[in-house]
């Protein structure tokens, strides 16, 4: 089993990042922590996509990875996507310093991320508590901004 | 098409109680955050509770903590408020809407009159 | 609780103008604001959430721009039924807060 994972973001635009993940236990959390830059200030939707497919660039790594077929929920709650790691907050330089423990994702398993897509938005998620249906698939966090396949690291 | 519709507003004495009933329809009910807004007569608008999809989490602002509670029965589309101790300043038109923290479809409202 | 200052709370003008509507905030809120629409009598409309997202249905010469504390809701070329209150309301943080309106008239 993978213990360490390591994924590099990457857009169109001035949006990068390197994002590392790390799993002690196979049954454990995974410590997430990595900077990204080039962001607007404020907060930004970060989820783990279905594919590792960057053919057509971030857009082709499809929808949140959510193989429970539940709602889009954030990191807290008990429905939500497996994917779904919530919002990272960029600071008025435009730089998001990352620190996410998460329980859910996994770097083995049903739950493992690693070969699917990594991606930071535009805007910010509303965690599945908006008034329309895209609330409850993508929690409204608008277009891709940076993404990459998140990788196994040494 | 969305529909929330409203009931059980009236005239009630300082201190009183009511329950109001919104009854949704056109969508997946269970899916959804629901709220409560108010707007007092000529007023702005206030938000005043929220409950999850599932009815496992609630939250009020301050001004009705402890005397109003939100419920939900998703086997008959429905979103409740039960407000006891009712003020003065209570009185206004109640909103059901569709969302948690950003409201899409309202209800066209029910008006709760608090007066001696 | 974040507050919000909403202007100005009156504006006359006429159809086909170009209006804006301003709504400044006490701290950053990110994109956690949408737009309503309410007329006299009726319950309020939905326009904009998260800034600059259109509601499904809503006329295109409705727009929302703005980032941090400072954001604005424009009207490219008002039309009659135009004329209503608007608010501002942002769900960055609890309480969820509206601004106080304002309400466009005709001139």
């Known amino acids: 089993m993978a213990t360490k994972a390591v994924c590099v973001l990457k857009g169109d635009g001035p949006v990068q990042g390197i994002i590392n993940f790390e799993q002690k236990e196979s049954n454990g959390p995974v410590k997430v922590w990595g900077s990204i830059k080039g962001l607007t200030e404020g907060l930004h939707g970060f989820h783990v996509h279905e594919f590792g497919d960057n053919t057509a660039g971030c857009t082709s790594a499809g929808p949140h990875f959510n193989p429970l077929s539940r709602k889009h929920g954030g990191p807290k709650d008990e429905e939500r996507h497996v994917g779904d790691l919530g919002n990272v907050t960029a600071d008025k330089d435009g730089v998001a310093d990352v620190s996410i423990e998460d329980s859910v994702i996994s770097l083995s398993g049903d739950h493992c991320i690693i070969g699917r897509t990594l991606v930071v938005h535009e805007k910010a998620d509303d965690l599945g508590k908006g008034g329309n249906e895209e609330s409850t698939k993508t929690g409204n966090a608008g277009s891709r901004l940076a993404c990459g396949v998140i990788g196994i690291a040494q | 098409e969305v529909q929330l519709v409203e009931s059980g507003g009236g005239l009630v004495q300082p201190g009183g109680s009511l329950r109001l009933s919104c009854a949704a329809s056109?969508?997946?009910?269970?899916?959804?955050?629901m709220s409560w807004v108010r707007q007092a007569p000529g007023k702005g608008l206030e938000w005043v509770a929220n409950i999850k999809h599932d009815g496992s989490e609630q939250d009020y602002v301050d001004s009705v903590k402890g005397r109003f509670t939100i419920s939900r029965d998703n086997a008959k589309n429905s979103l409740y408020l039960q407000m006891n101790s009712l003020r003065a300043e209570d009185t206004a038109v109640y909103y059901c809407?569709?969302?948690?923290?950003?409201?899409?479809?309202w209800g066209q409202g029910t008006l709760v009159t608090v007066s001696s | 609780v974040i507050w919000m200052t909403q202007s100005p709370s009156l504006l006359s003008a006429s159809t086909g103008d170009r209006v804006t509507i301003s709504c400044r905030m006490s701290q950053g809120i990110s994109s956690y604001l949408a737009w309503y629409q309410q007329k006299p009598g009726k319950a309020p409309e939905l326009l904009i959430y998260a800034v600059s997202t259109l509601q499904s249905g809503v006329p295109s010469r409705f727009s929302g721009s703005g980032s941090g504390t400072d954001f604005t809701l424009t009207i490219s070329s008002l039309q009659s039924e135009d004329f209503a209150t608007y608010y501002c309301?942002?769900?960055?943080?609890?309480?969820?807060?509206f601004g106080q309106g304002t309400k466009l008239e005709i001139k």
């Open positions: 809407a569709r969302g948690g923290i950003w409201f899409g479809p």
């Open positions: 056109g969508f997946t009910f269970s899916s959804f955050w």
């Open positions: 309301q942002q769900y960055y943080s609890f309480p969820y807060t």
